[in-house]
């Protein structure tokens, strides 16, 4: 259950999907990937204030305990709730092949 | 694919399962839960250095981009990989009921 989508820290400051442009070199993939040469990486970035997009009961517990013991228990963290698949053309021992990766690009985000 | 379980920061410093004792009051549950009166909350706490317990390709990408752009891209975060169910005896309008929660206690951890 997503608990709230209103960000009390101001627009764009809380957990949400961001796009970061990255080259094969940036990703350390130049030695095994041929295409694409550049990836629009979607990832989850931002703060997780109290009950914002809480993924589940565990996230709600974490919020409560972080409020009580901030030095011991970290705040919930902004991570992917689901992924978009992506295809890579990769080098193999014998040549190239097209491979689909299901866990590469974040599709949407929540706090956990 | 878990990439590595060796913590380069020293024993116990990296992402792993911790137990935090919490009362119903700590959790904000006193008004709707009768038992247990205290919960041994298992949660995932610790750093996620390069490729440590990387949950998937996305986590590996995040590590690479964090190294390049630490102010833009956060390091991967230590979160539950799976959960242990837990039963709560909760108050209802008509009395009490026994309810199982599948997403309350972390079972093991990874970095994402």
């Amino acid at each position: 259950a997503r608990n709230g989508d209103h960000c009390p820290l101001g627009p764009g400051r809380c957990c949400r999907l961001h796009t970061v442009r990255a080259s094969l070199e940036d990703l350390g993939w130049a030695d095994w990937v041929l295409s694409p040469r550049e990836v629009q990486v979607t990832m989850c970035i931002g703060a997780c204030p109290s009950q914002f997009r809480a993924a589940n009961m565990h996230a709600q517990i974490k919020t409560s305990l972080h409020r009580l013991k901030p030095d011991t228990v970290p705040a919930p963290c902004c991570v992917p709730a689901s992924y978009n698949p992506m295809v890579l053309i990769q080098k193999t021992d014998t040549g190239v092949s097209l491979q689909t990766y299901d866990d590469l690009l974040a599709k949407d985000c929540h706090c956990i | 694919a878990r990439n590595g379980d060796h913590c380069p920061l020293g024993p116990g410093r990296c992402c792993r399962l911790h137990t935090v004792r919490a009362s119903l009051e700590d959790l904000g549950w006193a008004d709707w839960v009768l038992s247990p009166r205290e919960v041994q909350v298992t949660m995932c706490i610790g750093a996620c250095p390069s490729q440590f317990r990387a949950a998937n390709m996305h986590a590996q990408i995040k590590t690479s981009l964090h190294r390049l752009k630490p102010d833009t891209v956060p390091a991967p975060c230590c979160v539950p990989a799976s959960y242990n169910p837990m039963v709560l005896i909760q108050k209802t309008d008509t009395g009490v009921s026994l309810q199982t929660y599948d997403d309350l206690l972390a079972k093991d951890c990874h970095c994402i």
Epitope: S35, M86, I89 | -
Partner: antibody
């Protein structure tokens, strides 16, 4: 496994509109990087690339035919469509659809033949 | 548009020989070139991607080379099943363009 199959009318008269369908299985056009291209080949001649549609609905056309071409997709039913308006005898050819990952044409359909004749 | 020229329309070779099919681009296309094989009555099949990388499952007697404007497909130890037409293609820029094809005949 990946398969693509083209279907079309077989015969058209000049000035009519050609509607082609590429039905595919074994992959999804919602996958980032995936696309489908249409290519044609007049009998005994070379290959001519016509149009391409990407997973994100970005479309590319051969400029020499752009005003006559429309490519579209139905991701949920795994189909890609191509329309060519005002066909002429010069459009007589075998029409192929091919799967692409980025720019990698790795699977082709068997082709569908069009004859334009009055 | 980038023009891909395969100057030899036909090439004749014998089983066991080595043959080289050439392709010239009208402008620099880097290594963004693919090669396709089309057997009689069949649809094209990918052989080489990015000028020199074999498609998965392609026998290693097929090799690609070149960059910029000049590209070569070499078939070592030609087999009878290699009787086909070979097309180069550039994907450096739209529109994608193909060479006119080179038909390989087996003596």
């Amino acid at each position: 496994q990946v398969t693509l199959k083209e279907s079309g009318p077989g015969i058209l008269q000049p000035s009519q509109t050609l509607s082609l369908t590429c039905s595919f299985s074994g992959f999804s056009l919602s996958t980032s990087g995936m696309g489908v291209s249409w290519i044609r080949q007049p009998s005994g001649k070379g290959l001519e690339w016509l149009a391409h549609i990407y997973w994100d609905d970005d479309k590319r056309y051969n400029p020499s035919l752009k005003s006559r071409l429309t490519i579209s997709k139905d991701t949920s039913s795994n189909r890609v469509f191509l329309k060519i308006t005002s066909v002429d005898t010069a459009d007589t050819a075998t029409y192929y659809c091919a799967r692409t990952g980025w720019d990698f044409f790795d699977y082709w359909g068997q082709g569908t033949t069009l004859t334009v004749s009055s | 548009d980038i023009v891909m020229t395969q100057s030899q329309k036909f090439m004749s070779t014998s089983v066991g020989d080595r043959v080289s099919v050439t392709c010239k681009a009208s402008q620099n296309v880097g290594t963004n070139v693919a090669w396709y094989q089309q057997k009689p009555g069949q649809s094209p099949k990918g052989l080489i991607y990015s000028a020199s990388y074999r498609y998965s499952g392609v026998p290693d007697r097929f090799t690609g080379s070149g960059s910029g404007t000049d590209f070569t497909l070499t078939i070592n130890n030609v087999q009878s099943e290699d009787l086909a037409e070979y097309f180069c293609q550039q994907y450096n820029s739209y529109p994608y363009t193909f060479g006119g094809g080179t038909k390989l005949e087996i003596k």
